[in-house]
């Protein structure tokens, strides 16, 4: 069967004016995943995100991330898009004063 | 008031080129996706291109791809679109429409240009 | 590439009538990046109702849309003069962004 991916968002200081936004999946299987970041609903292009490698965890599952730069408070328009195993989900980015969040999709 | 006006459209011979222009005012026009949609006479709607804020992330129909470009100008606050190697198939209404941020979709359109391919 | 199909192609209606109009997908798609366009004659389209079921500013509440997977529908609870048009389902969950071939919509 598939176990659906743990999703997180989190945020930190690029550069002045700057934020860089990453979002996690991990504890998923099988290996295949689609992660992205959306700006107004639409995925942007790969050269202005970074993955990482999907990798395992050692339970079994996989990890991977992608993250990409925005510019403070345009953090409305942009949210994590993941598809795994036919589901799939969108995650917005965390407020300032909150640096994370977390979902279990089933 | 949202505003697109867009120009250049005509008649173009197969083959040819043509460059069309939409200006945009009423809004802070480097803050938004814009998008070229189509309609051929009587026919339905046609996605054409998209270029986001920064121009950093650009889309094409399958139908257009290796032959227009979409680009924008933001300080002029004009989005562009240049048509190369033009068919038949390729005369159409071209609507300059914004991109609504957040939840994405064609929110404004202006009111169109025609290009006509005809020899 | 994600084909949407909307049946019917052509509806006549008569003023009351409650109208329904489908779009399919060909692959599933996500309920926030589909959207409906309403085109009369002679005139741009207009966003009718967007992420499958808010009506865009000015749209009449007669007008709902819902759906989720593959399959979406724009419904008209009161068919009135003013909704014979032509209304189109729209698609960016991928790339190539597509639109339905419409759905014409007349007065009998």
């Known amino acids: 069967g598939s176990v659906p991916p743990m999703v997180n968002v989190t945020r930190s200081e690029a550069s002045e004016g700057n934020i860089t936004v990453t979002c996690r999946a991990s504890s998923f299987y099988p290996r295949n995943i689609t992660l992205t970041w959306r700006q107004d609903g639409v995925s942007l292009s790969h050269d202005t995100q970074q993955w990482g490698d999907v990798l395992p965890d050692g339970n079994g599952t996989y990890q991977t991330w992608v993250a990409t730069r925005i510019c403070q408070g345009e953090e409305q328009r942009f949210t994590c898009y993941m598809e795994h195993s036919g589901n799939h989900s969108t995650h917005p980015v965390p407020s300032g004063n909150s640096h994370h969040h977390h979902h279990h999709h089933h | 008031d949202v505003h697109l006006v867009e120009s250049g459209g005509g008649l173009v011979q197969p083959g040819g080129s043509r460059k069309l222009s939409c200006a945009a005012s009423g809004f802070t026009f480097n803050t938004f996706g814009m998008n070229w949609v189509r309609q051929a006479p009587e026919k339905g709607l046609e996605w054409v291109a998209y270029?986001?804020?920064?121009?950093?992330?650009?889309y094409y129909a399958d139908t257009v791809k290796g032959r227009f470009t979409i680009s924008r100008d933001n300080p002029k606050n004009t989005l562009f679109l240049q048509m190369t190697s033009l068919r038949s198939e390729d005369t159409a209404m071209y609507y300059c429409?914004?991109?609504?941020?957040?939840?994405?979709?064609?929110?404004?359109w202006g009111q169109g240009t025609l290009v006509t391919v005809s020899a | 590439q994600i084909v949407l199909t909307q049946s019917p192609a052509f509806k006549s209606s008569s003023l009351g009538e409650r109208v329904t109009m489908t779009c399919t997908a060909s692959?599933?798609?996500?309920?926030?990046?589909l959207h409906w366009y309403q085109q009369k004659p002679g005139s741009s389209p207009k966003l009718w109702i967007y992420?499958?079921?808010n009506l865009a500013s000015g749209v009449p509440a007669r007008f709902s849309g819902s759906g989720s997977g593959t399959s979406y529908s724009l419904t008209i609870s009161t068919m009135e003069a003013e909704d014979a048009a032509t209304y189109y389902c729209?698609?960016?969950?991928?790339?190539?962004?597509?639109f339905g071939s419409g759905t014409k919509v007349e007065i009998k």
């Open positions: 729209h698609q960016h969950h991928r790339s190539p962004f597509t």
């Open positions: 692959s599933s798609i996500s309920s926030s990046y």
């Open positions: 270029i986001n804020s920064g121009s950093n992330t650009i």
């Open positions: 992420t499958t079921s």
């Open positions: 429409t914004r991109w609504e941020p957040v939840t994405g979709g064609f929110s404004y």
